[in-house]
Interface confidence: medium
């Protein structure tokens, strides 16, 4: 029988290269059993993680897993940085690995590359 502990499956050292001005959904995959835990997002600032209280979030439910989504509508240059989700479950705090957003400001890019091109050619971010 499967464990009923809550697990947060953000990949260790995961990164997303995104463009300022685009919408983006940052997903926190959450595994739970009976009761959905309270999940929050925070943004790392040095050694502390600042809770993102006023941001739009939503849940997406799939067959074997749920996603707690942080919405960026649109992405802003200062969204660059590392994020973490955490869950409160039976008085325990469970924290995910951090995930990093690399935001390219389209104003500084001479030509706007496609998302797929950015994913396959990350050096475009640093032109």
């Amino acid at each position: 029988k499967e464990s009923c502990d809550v697990q947060l499956y953000i990949k260790r050292q995961s990164e997303h290269s995104i463009l300022a001005g685009d919408p983006f959904e940052l997903e926190c995959p959450v595994k739970y059993c009976a009761n959905r835990p309270h999940v929050t997002w925070c943004k790392l600032n040095g050694t502390t993680c600042v809770k993102l209280e006023d941001r739009q979030t939503s849940w997406k439910e799939e067959k074997n897993i749920s996603f707690f989504i942080l919405h960026f509508e649109p992405v802003l240059p200062n969204d660059n940085g590392s994020y973490r989700c955490s869950a409160n479950f039976q008085s325990n705090l469970i924290e995910s690995h951090s995930t990093t957003l690399y935001v390219t400001d389209v104003k500084s890019a001479s030509e706007r590359p496609s998302k797929d091109e950015m994913a396959s050619r990350p050096w475009l971010l640093y032109r």
């Epitope: 990949k11 290269s17 690995h97 994913a119 990350p122």
Partner: antibody, heavy 118, light 111 residues
Framework: EVQLQESGPSLVKPSQTLSLTCSVT????????WNWIRKFPGNKLEYMGY???????YFNPSLKSRISITRNTSKNQYYLQLNSVTTEDTATYYC????????????WGHGTTLTVSS | DIVLTQSPASLAVSLGQRATISCRAS??????????MHWYQQKAGQPPKLLIY???NLESGIPARFSGSGSRTDFTLTINPVEADDVATYYC?????????FGGGTKLEIK
């Protein structure tokens, strides 16, 4: 049902570039993680890398200078490119999906056998 | 990289008996608060097939003769009872840390 199918050449000359395609049906490559794995003649399995739902990539450091993984979301395909191949790259190449929930590989392609020889 | 050492390299078991395959990791597999160790079966000419995920969970459609156990650095795949159709090579895999790695494989034969 999720199905993956590899396609590409069966023979490549040393120093050339290998290009493989993985065509996915039954799921969108804008969800989960999409991987390349190879199996050498001695039966050793090597993980090569992935492209994620968002388009971010990870490459095994042992291949990092030679490998590229890209995708075409409208065709629901992803691609492996391996530069400067040698006879050591002779292997069966598999594409596979890994789930968010533990990253295990739940669906695999049948594999395509590559020989590197002049 | 996390090195996975499988033992034995080959195994001959009589029909109806128990087969036990071990996988030892060079580092602890628990960074997600979970054991991201998985087991695959590969028959000749076929791709690997997922049997057990996250150390002990049986993949849908896999017979209950297969079971997985273990945590931290020591993991075990058990087949009980062994059937003729189980002749294959079995691999453990960790997805706790990049790059993902596989064990060297255990070839199961019928005695």
């Amino acid at each position: 049902e999720v199905q993956l199918q590899e396609s590409g050449p069966s023979l490549v000359k040393p120093s050339q570039t290998l290009s493989l395609t993985c065509s996915v049906t039954g799921d969108s490559i804008t969800s989960a993680y999409w991987n390349w794995i190879r199996k050498f003649p001695g039966n050793k399995l090597e993980y090569m890398g992935y492209i994620s739902y968002s388009g971010s990539t990870y490459f095994n450091p042992s291949l990092k200078s030679r490998i590229s993984i890209t995708r075409n979301t409208s065709k629901n395909q992803y691609y492996l490119q391996l530069n400067s191949v040698t006879t050591e790259d002779t292997a069966t190449y598999y594409c596979a999906r890994s789930h968010y929930y533990g990253y295990y590989f739940d669906y695999w392609g049948h594999g395509t056998t590559l020989t590197v020889s002049s | 990289d996390i090195v996975l050492t499988q033992s034995p390299a080959s195994l001959a078991v009589s029909l109806g008996q128990r087969a036990t395959i071990s996988c030892r990791a060079s580092e602890t597999i628990d960074s997600y608060g979970d054991s991201l160790m998985h087991w695959y079966q590969q028959k000749a000419g076929q791709p690997p097939k997922l049997l057990i995920y996250r150390a002990s969970n049986l993949e849908s459609g896999i017979p209950a003769r297969f079971s997985g156990s273990g945590s931290r650095t020591d993991f075990t795949l058990t087949i009980n009872p062994v059937e003729a159709d189980d002749v294959a090579t079995y691999y453990c895999q960790q997805t706790d840390e990049d790059p993902y790695t596989f064990g060297g494989g255990t070839k199961l034969e019928i005695k």
